[in-house]
């Protein structure tokens, strides 16, 4: 994300197209309080960060509320008055969508439809991962709206589900971040469970009539 200028590595995360976090790793300045200066218009004076992130007592990043215009951030990381890293970035390329909200499950026999609130911007993928204790790894299904139907489930098995949002790479590029996962929820026979047993429960013997 950031070529090293004077050994400074930067990382940008644009949370939900609302808040931007710029962090830096500067081995040369590891015991120094570098300052962060920014602007959202190319011709304005720089403002200084008012919400620093600290690591081991020293500044390591800045959290900003973005001006939602053209999403260009101009910034300068300084040691006193000396700039050690100056750049501009189109923040959208570093999008991290917010975690899915209002996740709901609608069961119908051997299928479940998982829905949540769509985010206010587009070109996203809503991914549902699920597994039962019988599965060695998570299964996955994704759609471009938060309305994902998974079929072929075994009504007798307990399934764990979680959901996340990803930015489409052909729109946002390769440097975005998936959202955090939603909380895991467990379901069996269309009812919510506290957890799925870690080991598969043996099937109950059928009583002959």
């Amino acid at each position: 994300q950031g070529g090293a200028a004077e050994g400074v590595q930067i990382q940008i995360i644009y949370f939900n197209l609302e808040t931007v976090q710029v962090t830096w790793n500067a081995s040369k300045y590891s015991r120094t309080n570098l300052t962060f200066h920014y602007r959202f218009n190319g011709d304005e004076a720089y403002d200084q960060c008012t919400n620093y992130l600290l690591q081991e007592g020293h500044t390591s990043g800045c959290l900003l509320d973005a001006e939602q215009r053209d999403d260009i951030l101009y910034f300068s990381i300084r040691n006193g008055t000396h700039p050690v890293f100056t750049a501009s970035r189109w923040m959208v390329y570093y999008l991290k969508p917010s975690s899915p909200k209002h996740v709901r499950f609608s069961w119908h026999q051997d299928a479940v439809t998982v829905t949540c609130s769509d985010l206010s911007y587009g070109d996203l993928l809503y991914e549902v991962q699920y597994r039962s204790p019988f599965d060695t790894e998570w299964q996955s299904k994704q759609e471009n709206t938060c309305n994902v139907t998974i079929e072929g489930l075994d009504a007798e098995k307990c399934y764990s589900f979680w959901v996340r949002v990803k930015a489409m790479e052909d729109v946002y590029g390769p440097d975005t971040y998936p959202s955090d996962w939603s909380e895991v929820t467990c379901w069996q026979r269309g009812e919510i469970r506290d957890a799925c047993a870690e080991t598969p429960t043996p099937p109950k013997p059928k009583l002959s009539k």
Partner: antibody
Amino acid sequence: QVQLKQSGPGLVQPSQSLSITCTVSGFSLTIYGLHWVRQSPGKGLEWLGVIWRGGSTDYNAAFMSRLRITKDNSKSQVFFKMDSLQADDTAIYYCAKPYYDYDGNWYFDVWGAGTTVTVSS
Amino acid sequence: DIVMTQSQKFMSTSVGDRVSVTCKASQNVGTNVAWYQKKSGQSPKPLIYSASSHCSEVPDRFTGSGSGTDFTLTINNVQSEDLAEYFCQQYNRYPLTFGTGTKLEVR
């Protein structure tokens, strides 16, 4: 692929309003702003205004009092309305989409075909 | 507003020649300049941005240079299809402003 389709009248009476719709496909108005530019005979290209992805607008001060840009994200449409047209507003009106590189440098990569507007009685 | 001046309204050249179109900004715009080609009856087509970066699918005979207030679009090995009007544009400050245009005539 990215396309901007413009629809609007060709002839406008003096003192009347001009309304143009720009319908976009291949990208989302929730990510990109949309700009409006015109070319008047003998006047070159003139930037009129923009509606940003969040819905806020910036206008060229010369047109601020009579220009309004709105949009409907769900229909992928942007609406341009200019009031009180006079003969010197005769021009080709374009909507245009920006492309940004990683460093925040940009240009208008896709333009509508243009709406030719003549102001005359 | 920043004024972008293209002092030459018309330029004449021959196929195979090299031609330079110039643009002067009324104040420092860094490298925040783009160039567009406009053919009659068509929409503008981007050629160069950030003063010297190529827009996608633009032949490399088009090159841009300059920073601050003075900018140049150079067309090497001019082709007949380069008959068009060329505009510079600054995006350093709103309102965005364009140059007055230079019409290229290919003999």
